[in-house]
């Protein structure tokens, strides 16, 4: 699996899941999260040539045909497969709320 | 939605499902399929700005920050949403075959 | 573009009621935090309470805590500031504010809204 216990060990040029931190203010411009300041949300990198962890029939056909067709700008794309919630803490005025925000950090990627 | 309703009708320039053909000999060097020759399969393509069909919560995110660091290699890519399957006609010997292939076509797209 | 219009202010008197009105556009659909403010003259901006558009949670200040309601009408893309028993010192230039990135909760602090109304003048007098 294209997962962080493979894709952070390894120096994989092809699609896999990359590090990445992202503060809530700087990058994001959002003030409401109080806790925590930022998060590491990783990202999806690289390319997806054919049999790379393609996702389904239509993406081994698409592979395949980037292969016999190497010009053309029709190819698999490296997204998110597994994605995990992210807890935070917010404020209701100043009351403070706890919520988990859903499908905020990617474990892997797959060849969409 | 970034189907072919929309898509094939407009001009859009981001992420939507764009026209293509493939041809299963020229294209991908498959033999073993007798019908069709080849199918209109279609693609996407296109940006993933913020608020353009965003897939899920960490699709958002991303966009964002893409927004706020426009050279990041970071961003959403436009994937198909929709797929639906082809009918085939193939041979075992000289025993005509007909199979469905799930997930050939692509019908509309979203940013992940 | 985002844009809050606030309207509903005016005289009345001691013990009086107004609504306040903030119409808000530009925003993701039921997200983001409304938050209320007012300025009296020669006086610090007060945060009087707020709402989150998405789950209608709020938030009120102590000194208007029973006398001012926030409620909000996501179809309508207002919200509103309800307030009874209207004293002198309730006097000012009232104002809505928005943080539309908000999908949870809501500020008491003016220095999280991005985007503010232009105002409505409230006066209590007899």
């Known amino acids: 699996a294209l997962d962080t216990n493979y894709c952070f060990s390894s120096t994989e040029k092809n699609c896999c899941v990359r590090q990445l931190y992202i503060d809530f203010r700087k990058d994001l411009g959002w003030k409401w999260i109080h806790e925590p300041k930022g998060y590491h949300a990783n990202f999806c990198l690289g390319p997806c040539p054919y049999i790379w962890s393609l996702d389904t029939q239509y993406s081994k056909v698409l592979a395949l045909y980037n292969q016999h067709n190497p010009g053309a700008s029709a190819a698999p794309c490296c997204v998110p497969q597994a994605l995990e919630p992210l807890p935070i803490v917010y404020y209701v005025g100043r009351k403070p709320k706890v919520e988990q925000l859903s499908n905020m950090i990617v474990r892997s990627c797959k060849c969409s | 939605a970034l189907d072919t309703n929309y898509c094939f009708s407009s001009t859009e320039k981001n992420c939507c499902v764009r026209q293509l053909y493939i041809d299963f000999r020229k294209d991908l060097g498959w033999k073993w399929i007798h019908e069709p020759k080849g199918y209109h399969a279609n693609f996407c393509l296109g940006p993933c700005p913020y608020i353009w069909s965003l897939d899920t919560q960490y699709s958002k995110v991303l966009a964002l920050y893409n927004q706020h660091n426009p050279g990041a290699s970071a961003a959403p890519c436009c994937v198909p949403q929709a797929l639906e399957p082809l009918p085939i006609v193939y041979y075992v010997g000289r025993k005509p075959k007909v199979e469905q292939l799930s997930n050939m076509i692509v019908r509309s797209c979203k940013c992940s | 573009e985002v844009q809050l219009v606030e309207s509903g202010g005016g005289e009345v008197r001691p013990g009086g009621s107004l609504r306040l009105s903030c119409v808000v556009s530009?925003?993701?659909?039921?997200?983001?935090?409304i938050g209320w403010f007012r300025q009296a003259p020669g006086q610090e901006r007060e945060g009087l309470g707020c709402?989150?558009?998405?789950?209608?949670?709020?938030w009120s200040a102590d000194s208007v805590k029973g006398r001012f309601t926030i409620s909000r009408d996501n179809v309508r893309n207002t919200v509103y500031l309800q307030m009874n028993a209207l004293k002198p010192e309730d006097r000012g230039v009232y104002y809505c504010?928005?943080?539309?990135?908000?999908?949870?909760?809501?500020?008491?602090?003016?220095?999280?809204?991005?985007?503010w109304g232009q105002g409505t003048q409230v006066t209590v007098s007899s």
């Open positions: 530009g925003f993701t659909k039921d997200y983001g935090a």
């Open positions: 504010a928005g943080d539309p990135s908000a999908l949870y909760g809501c500020s008491d602090r003016s220095s999280e809204y991005q985007y």
């Open positions: 709402i989150a558009r998405k789950d209608g949670d709020t």
